[in-house]
């Protein structure tokens, strides 16, 4: 057992049929010594009385607020939760499997730029008697600071009968050094509760590697005269890092006929503009990838040929 | 560029730019392990990283870029070491198509770039870890060249940033 | 895209030789290696060497030395596999491949196999 | 050499099965193992790289693992279109070797 924070604990239970479970020792939080009761939750049943109460952990039932009462006020609450271990895996029941870039991926982290700010998000078919708490750092034994916000809900999706919930968070490493080359990487820990059950996800990765670029802005076509070819341009996103002499992009360019089937021709560019022949109801995409690193490549950004 | 000469900053950039390539090439990002899970982090702690205070920032390029030039020279000289290593010669056998081949060559070459002839700028003492098994020396290969990854990326940017902004 | 295409079968007699070649294209054919495999009727897959034709220089497994001899001819960017003394234990389909560009030897590309027949 | 002892040598299943195909490297070959599917009549189709790597194009049910001498290629849901032979390939050290095969056929 250990505790989260005031007053909420953690059981570690492992999850068998006919486990023991855990032996759990609360102690009432006063200077009282006599006349003290114990109750689990709303039941005004009493469990015991005396300054602490031993109890058995074997499941959910057993898990709760727990109140210490004298002369029928509440003395203190000691909240207990559950950590299940099956064949000696912690569970993961609150979060979906995102599968991307591999089995086992709970959390899904991306950064814009190499600022130090990532946004992390995961994603739960639970809708309700759900909280999420967020910590990170960089690097574990000798953490340096990173800042997370408040857990959003950033989306809600329908998926066949079932509706998923996308919740993400935003974070900012306090002393970020974009030029440098990280050699430690960024730890996330995820806590979620889920009525009385407690779950820890975590991810660990390095900005470099999670790095995935806005869509390139204000892509233009310009007819070239007396000619099927038109010159297209395009610029870096906003929120790519400066200067863009030291952080500088590659570009993807393609063609995309009305038809999805027809054949694409991908060109691959330092330049911020190219030559292409761009017919009638066809689409010019581009897109953008970090130029030394092979990270993410961003989504396109798309203009109609005509 | 001992003794506070320019490099040839464009001849350096393209250089840097095919190391990228190169490296990418060598070990490319697939899914059958994730490097930090396993041991031996000891070899890889040892290589030089650019660090925020190397002055390889575009604000510490223009005020001197020697800092820098100075720790990417120690870096190419250490991977390259590390490149013609048993590591890398002995089993899991590599063909001799191997990008390694080329990128051990291409480090070689930056790094002469960088110290012409004559000039000997001091070098830190390059590990010699000859792991026996086949699985800790791929391990290790894998390693190395996520490492280099990461270095020479910050080596063609700062390359790219001098050749468009400090050169004469 | 990347094609390796070999020649069509043959049927040979016992100690006679056979040359088998693999034409590549779609790749800058002295970029990579190329390997050459075999598989007797109703068999399993042998290793039997391979040719970097940028420097020419072929390398055997040790029980196809003075059996095999591989080359490759960079104009026409077409590689040959020399199969000497054939018996009829070397009846077999035999293939070209080309690996990944990461430098290992697994095989991605592969051309449509050659079937030899030693038989009197 | 490396041996790479492969079993079963054939294996009748059922659609919709998981199938499980084992190979044994005579010595330490870290992950260097491939897997082929090989069809009748066809050429060797590479299905999986360093043990666990899934190639460009595999269908998701194929799955590589193992590490040093112990290999497993399984498919989770057996398709009719999986009926072919299976080959294990170790490229860790020359020559390079592979497994006698597994035929899989449907039940």
């Known amino acids: 057992i250990w505790e989260l924070k005031k007053d909420v604990y953690v059981v570690e239970l492992d999850w068998y049929p006919d486990a023991p479970g855990e032996m759990v020792v609360l102690t009432c939080d006063t200077p009282e010594e006599d006349g003290i009761t114990w109750t689990l939750d709303q039941s005004g049943e009493v469990l015991g009385s005396g300054k602490t109460l031993t109890i058995q952990v074997k499941e959910f039932g057993d898990a709760g607020q727990y109140t210490c009462h004298k002369g029928g006020e509440a003395l203190s609450h000691s909240l207990l939760l559950l950590h299940k271990k099956e064949d000696g895996i912690w569970s993961t029941d609150v979060l979906k499997d995102q599968k991307e870039p591999k089995n086992k991926t709970f959390l899904r982290c991306e950064a814009k730029n190499y600022s130090g700010r990532f946004t992390c998000w995961w994603l739960t078919t639970i809708s309700t008697d759900l909280t999420f708490s967020v910590k990170s750092s960089r690097g574990s034994s000798n953490p340096q600071g990173v800042t997370c916000g408040a857990v959003t809900l950033s989306a809600e999706r329908v998926r066949g009968d079932n509706k998923e919930y996308e919740y993400s968070v935003e974070c900012q490493e306090d002393s970020a050094c974009p030029a440098a080359e990280e050699r430690l990487p960024i730890e996330v820990m995820v806590d979620a509760i889920h009525k009385l059950k407690y779950e820890n996800y975590t991810s660990s990765f390095f900005i470099r590697d999670i790095i995935k670029p806005d869509p390139p802005k204000n892509l233009q076509l310009k007819p070239l005269k007396n000619s099927r070819q038109v010159e297209v341009s395009w610029e870096y996103p906003d929120t790519w890092s400066t200067p863009h002499s030291y952080f500088s992009l590659t570009f993807c360019i393609q063609v995309q006929g009305k038809s999805k089937r027809e054949k694409k021709d991908r060109i691959f560019t330092d330049k911020t503009s190219a030559t292409v022949i761009c017919r009638k109801n066809a689409s010019f995409s581009v897109q953008a990838q970090d130029r030394y690193y092979s990270s993410s490549w961003s989504e396109w950004a798309s203009v109609p040929c005509s | 560029v001992p003794g506070g000469s320019s490099p040839a900053w464009a001849q350096c950039q393209q250089l840097s730019q095919k190391l990228c390539t190169l490296a990418w090439s060598a070990h490319p990002l697939v899914g059958h392990m994730d490097l930090r899970e396993e041991g031996d982090e000891e070899t890889t702690n040892d290589v030089p990283h650019i660090q925020c205070g190397d002055g390889c920032d575009p604000q510490g390029l223009r005020d001197n870029s020697q800092f820098c030039l100075q720790r990417i020279r120690q870096g190419l000289i250490f991977y390259e070491k590390l490149l013609g290593s048993d590591i890398f010669t002995g089993e899991p056998s590599l063909l001799p198509d191997s990008p390694v081949g080329q990128l051990h060559a291409s480090l070689l070459g930056l790094s002469q770039l960088l110290q012409p002839e004559g000039h000997h700028w001091e070098t830190q003492q390059i590990p010699s870890p000859s792991p026996s098994q086949p699985w800790q020396r791929l391990l290790l290969r894998f390693k190395i060249l996520r490492s280099l990854q990461a270095f020479v990326a910050v080596a063609a940017r700062v390359f790219a940033h001098g050749a468009a902004t400090l050169s004469p | 895209q990347v094609q390796l295409v070999q020649s069509g079968a043959e049927v040979k007699k016992p100690g006679s030789s056979v040359k088998v070649s693999c034409k590549a294209s779609?790749?800058?054919?002295?970029?990579?290696?190329i390997h050459w495999m075999r598989q007797a009727p109703g068999q399993g897959l042998e290793w039997i060497g391979y040719?970097?034709?940028?420097?020419?220089?072929?390398k055997y497994n040790e029980n196809f030395k003075g059996k095999v001899t591989i080359t490759a001819d960079k104009s026409t960017s077409t590689a040959y596999m020399e199969l000497s003394s054939l018996r009829s234990e070397d009846t077999a389909v035999y293939y070209c491949?080309?690996?990944?560009?990461?430098?290992?030897?697994?095989?991605?590309?592969w051309g449509q196999g050659t079937l030899v027949t030693v038989s009197s | 050499d490396i041996q790479m002892t492969q079993s079963p040598s054939s294996l009748s299943a059922s659609v919709g099965d998981r199938v499980t195909i084992t190979c044994k490297a005579s010595?330490?070959?870290?992950?260097?193992v491939a897997w082929y599917q090989q069809k009748p009549g066809k050429v060797p189709k590479l299905l999986i790289y360093?043990?666990?790597t899934r190639h460009t194009g595999v269908p998701s049910r194929f799955s590589g693992s193992g590490s040093r001498t112990d290999f497993t290629l399984t498919i989770s849901s057996l398709q009719p279109e999986d009926v072919a032979d299976y080959f294990c390939?170790?490229?860790?050290?020359?020559?390079?070797?592979f497994g006698s095969g597994t035929k899989l056929e449907i039940k």
């Open positions: 491949a080309i690996p990944d560009r990461s430098g290992y030897a697994w095989f991605i590309y």
């Open positions: 779609g790749y800058t054919f002295t970029d990579q290696t």
């Open positions: 040719i970097y034709p940028r420097d020419d220089s072929p």
């Open positions: 010595r330490d070959v870290a992950i260097a």
């Open positions: 360093w043990a666990s």
């Open positions: 390939h170790q490229y860790s050290s020359y020559p390079f070797t």
